[in-house]
């Protein structure tokens, strides 16, 4: 067990705050909830402090949640792949282009460390170039999740990984919307990490409304579980 | 566990104001003003955040009632001018552990006992 891993061994608290600017739009959001890394379980509630958000809440889940996968479960024979684990409670920079087909794109800065007994994820976000009829800004997407792959590899080069994956997101005329997303996430302390071998994260999410909540809100459940490295041959033989 | 005891509460004329405060036992996170007319839900009616930054009132009291709050005495505060005969209820103060400001009251874990404020 890397000494970060230590610290999810219960339900933590997680905060979570995001300044953002698309196309001119500049918008905060506050979200908080808990994680359980046993289950690879997130429940979060997000407000837009500002008012109405300018772009779909669904756009902003792997900036959110996604951008906390130290909670991901990750089975015993693939702990020692864990690298967002073991970054803490120093925590990593997560940085991440996402680039909508056929429109703009964003571009995250998140800081992710344990401020206290709270897990805080602190993002900037700038979206640019997008259609203001388009799929985002004419909020044409469904209030929907679709489950997806997240995959892993090492960056030895930065002592940390980088991380490929596309998104569905579904609209209303029951097309989809692409979101191809180009991830790195570096360490913030100097101490030891864990670089995996090649994995991915399967992620599950259920958006919902708090029907008393008057404020532009979001409520996300997520499940996420590493997977793709198997037992090694000494396992089997046992 | 923390307590809220709010006052300030009384019979005022319509047009008229009254300043409500909600002194805290302990620190608190995020704070808000909740009210019940006889016969009705309770309902939110304004709310300050932690840092005092965010503050979010319901459609019917924007621009008549003020929130703010002073973290040093753990009190908060709920300016009402420009009272209406429909702002008759019991005035309830609740408090969160977290400093983000919801709307919803079971995201409240603490809870005055409520002040009476009538207009005729």
């Known amino acids: 067990m890397s000494k970060g891993e230590e610290l999810f061994t219960g339900v933590v608290p997680i905060l979570v705050e995001l300044d953002g600017d698309v196309n001119g739009h500049k918008f905060s959001v506050s979200g908080e909830g808990e994680g359980d890394a046993t289950y690879g379980k997130l429940t979060l509630k997000f407000i837009c402090t500002t008012g109405k958000l300018p772009v779909p809440w669904p756009t902003l889940v792997t900036t959110f949640s996604y951008g906390v996968q130290c909670f991901s479960r990750y089975p015993d024979h693939m702990k020692q792949h864990d690298f967002f684990k073991s970054a803490m409670p120093e925590g990593y920079v997560q940085e991440r282009t996402i680039f909508f087909k056929d429109d703009g794109n964003y571009k995250t800065r998140a800081e992710v460390k344990f401020e206290g007994d709270t897990l805080v994820n602190r993002i900037e976000l700038k979206g640019i170039d997008f259609k203001e009829d388009g799929n985002i800004l004419g909020h044409k997407l469904e209030y929907n999740y679709n489950s997806h792959n997240v995959y892993i590899m090492a960056d030895k080069q930065k002592n940390g990984i980088k991380v490929n994956f596309k998104i569905r997101h579904n609209i209303e005329d029951g097309s989809v919307q692409l979101a191809d997303h180009y991830q790195q996430n570096t360490p913030i302390g100097d101490g030891p990490v864990l670089l995996p071998d090649n994995h991915y994260l399967s992620t599950q999410s259920a958006l919902s409304k708090d029907p008393n909540e008057k404020r532009d809100h979001m409520v996300l459940l997520e499940f996420v579980t590493a997977a793709g490295i198997t037992h090694g041959m000494d396992e089997l033989y046992k | 566990q923390v307590q809220l005891v709010e006052s300030g509460g009384g019979l005022v004329q319509a047009g008229g104001s009254l300043r409500l405060s909600c002194a805290a036992s302990g620190p608190t996170g995020a704070m808000a003003w909740f009210r019940q007319a006889p016969g009705k839900e309770r309902e939110f009616v304004g709310g300050?955040?932690?840092?005092?930054?965010?503050?979010y009132y319901v459609d019917s009291v924007k621009g008549r009632f003020t929130i703010d709050r002073d973290n040093a005495k753990n009190t908060v505060y709920l300016q009402m001018n420009s009272l209406k005969p429909e702002d008759t209820a019991v005035y309830y103060c609740a408090a969160r552990r977290s400093q983000i400001l919801f709307t919803s009251r079971t995201d409240y874990e603490f809870w005055g006992q409520g002040t009476q404020v009538t207009v005729s």
């Open positions: 300050i955040s932690r840092s005092g930054t965010d503050t």
